[in-house]
Interface confidence: medium
């Protein structure tokens, strides 16, 4: 997250970290069910661990943390690397979470976002770009949903209805390492960090997010079929 600020503790209990060995974060994710996460399909790696209820980036033990394995990874069937359409994936945890103030699911919004909606994006991704500098704790940033027209103008022939753009002033954006993390609008999960320009936070080059309102049926059916 570029030019965000430290999230208040306990305010993002659905935020998950996907870790490679040993405790190396490579993507964010979102708890949407007691045993299921959503993340970006481009975050797919099969050998990973899942950390929930953790505030700092470092692997130091925190009393609220819960650790899991991802036993199933189910990318949306319409996703195809290196494209950006349908960039979402469900991950089944090896057991159900223990609900606490630090670990709690969030509902996926069935309403598509309208331009101007204020949202919050969070993650442990780099706080500088193109340099890489990772934060000590979870970062939060207020962003606003842009109209689809402005989104398409920013990225001609690259935007479809499975994506939406959001940003703020130049210099504020999600970035590498935030992928798969949540965009929360009006208390519901609206999007996942998907892609954008490089370096991050360039003027008139907003972040692009997976438009989850288009996928509520697939999410529900996939969870039911694999539970």
């Amino acid at each position: 997250i570029i030019n965000g600020s430290d999230c208040d503790m306990h305010t993002q209990p659905w935020q998950a970290a996907l870790l490679l060995r040993p405790n190396q974060l490579y993507c964010g994710a979102v708890l949407v069910h007691p045993q299921w996460l959503l993340t970006a399909a481009h975050c797919r790696k099969k050998v990973f661990r899942v950390r929930l209820g953790h505030y700092s980036l470092s692997p130091v033990y925190e009393s609220g943390q819960q650790m899991f394995q991802g036993v199933k990874s189910i990318p949306h069937p319409g996703y195809s690397h290196p494209g950006h359409s349908n960039d979402l994936m469900l991950i089944k945890l090896n057991r159900r979470i223990r609900p606490t103030k630090d670990v709690r699911p969030i509902n996926v919004s069935s309403h598509c976002p309208s331009a101007g909606t204020k949202c919050l994006v969070s993650g442990w991704g780099t706080t500088k770009s193109p340099q890489v500098h990772f934060p000590k704790v979870l970062q939060c940033l207020n962003i606003s949903v842009l109209s689809q027209k402005r989104c398409e103008d920013a990225y001609p022939r690259q935007i479809d209805d499975t994506m939406f753009c959001a940003g703020d002033k130049a210099g504020r954006d999600s970035c590498q390492g935030d992928s798969g993390g949540p965009v929360v609008c009006n208390g519901s999960l609206q999007g996942l960090v998907s892609w954008g320009d490089y370096p991050c936070a360039r003027p008139n080059r907003p972040g692009v997010y997976t438009n989850l309102c288009k996928f509520t049926k697939w999410i529900q059916e996939t969870i039911q079929a694999n539970s």
């Epitope: 405790n23 099969k46 050998v47 991802g70 036993v71 199933k72 189910i74």
Partner: antibody, heavy 122, light 110 residues
Framework: QEQLEESGGGLVKPGASLTLTCTVS????????????MCWVRQAPGKGLEWIAS???????TDYASWATGRFTISKASSTTVTLQVTSLTAADTATYFC?????????????WGPGTLVTVS | AIEMTQTPSSASEPVGGTVTIKCQAS??????LSWYQQKPGQPPKLLIY???DLASGVSSRFKGSGSGTQFTLIISDVECADAATYYC????????????FGGGTEVVVK
């Protein structure tokens, strides 16, 4: 029921190369959804277990023990076979070679093993 | 490089006794430690993963504990069928590893 079986062992001469094959049944290495790794472990006669290499069949990413890099190659040959190629064999490579699977549900600990295949370098 | 040191190398215990095996990692491996049992002529069998979680079908007489660098396997109420060699294994990292397994502990039941 998940089963693994190694083949390709036997008596080989020093300096030779060898390909060991692990054939799986009851599951597929190209399962798109279930997360697991496959590995090779060896055990010299009367000695302890020695991890050689692991492969993630989902993205074919591999890990090797530091001593195995270069001379050993693990790969997914098909939806039912994982191979281990060994070059420049020496007497120190004489061992029973085991193929194993580690599931995400057991933190990738090796919860399924084959019976092993004996390689004798002489 | 993470190295695993297992003690003792052998242990002898009468039926009904308790065996304690220790495993030390050269650096912290969190809780990513497994224990295996191997009998002569057989492949290893997973007993415990994540330091203390019992694998499917394993007797509750086997108890794992520890985190960081110090781990323990306790076999209580030992039976003749427990005679085997026991190995610990770290799965915290697979980079720059000489061997992820400990050297083994042979358990003899008298």
């Amino acid at each position: 029921q998940e089963q693994l079986e190694e083949s390709g062992g036997g008596l080989v001469k020093p300096g030779a190369s060898l390909t060991l094959t692990c054939t799986v049944s009851g599951f597929s290495l190209t399962n798109n959804y279930v997360n697991f790794v496959m590995c090779w472990v060896r055990q010299a006669p009367g000695k302890g277990l020695e991890w050689i290499a692991s492969i993630d069949p989902g993205d074919d990413s591999t890990d090797y023990a530091s001593w195995a890099t270069g001379r050993f190659t693990i790969s997914k040959a098909s939806s039912t076979t994982v191979t281990l190629q060994v070059t420049s064999l020496t007497a120190a490579d004489t061992a029973t070679y085991f193929c194993a699977r580690g599931d995400a549900g057991t933190s990738y600990s090796f919860n399924f093993w084959g019976p092993g295949t004996l390689v004798t370098v002489s | 490089a993470i190295e695993m040191t297992q003690t003792p190398s052998s242990a002898s215990e009468p039926v009904g006794g308790t065996v304690t095996i220790k495993c030390q990692a050269s650096e912290s491996i969190s809780r990513y430690l497994s224990w295996y049992q191997q009998k002569p002529g057989q492949p290893p069998k997973l007993l415990i993963y994540d330091a203390s979680d019992l694998a499917s079908g394993v007797s509750s007489r086997f108890k794992g504990s520890g985190s960081g660098t110090q781990f323990t396997l306790i076999i209580s109420d030992v039976e003749c069928a427990d005679a085997a060699t026991y190995y610990c294994q770290q799965d915290y990292s697979r980079s720059n590893i000489v061997n992820s397994f400990g050297g083994g502990t042979e358990v003899v039941v008298k």
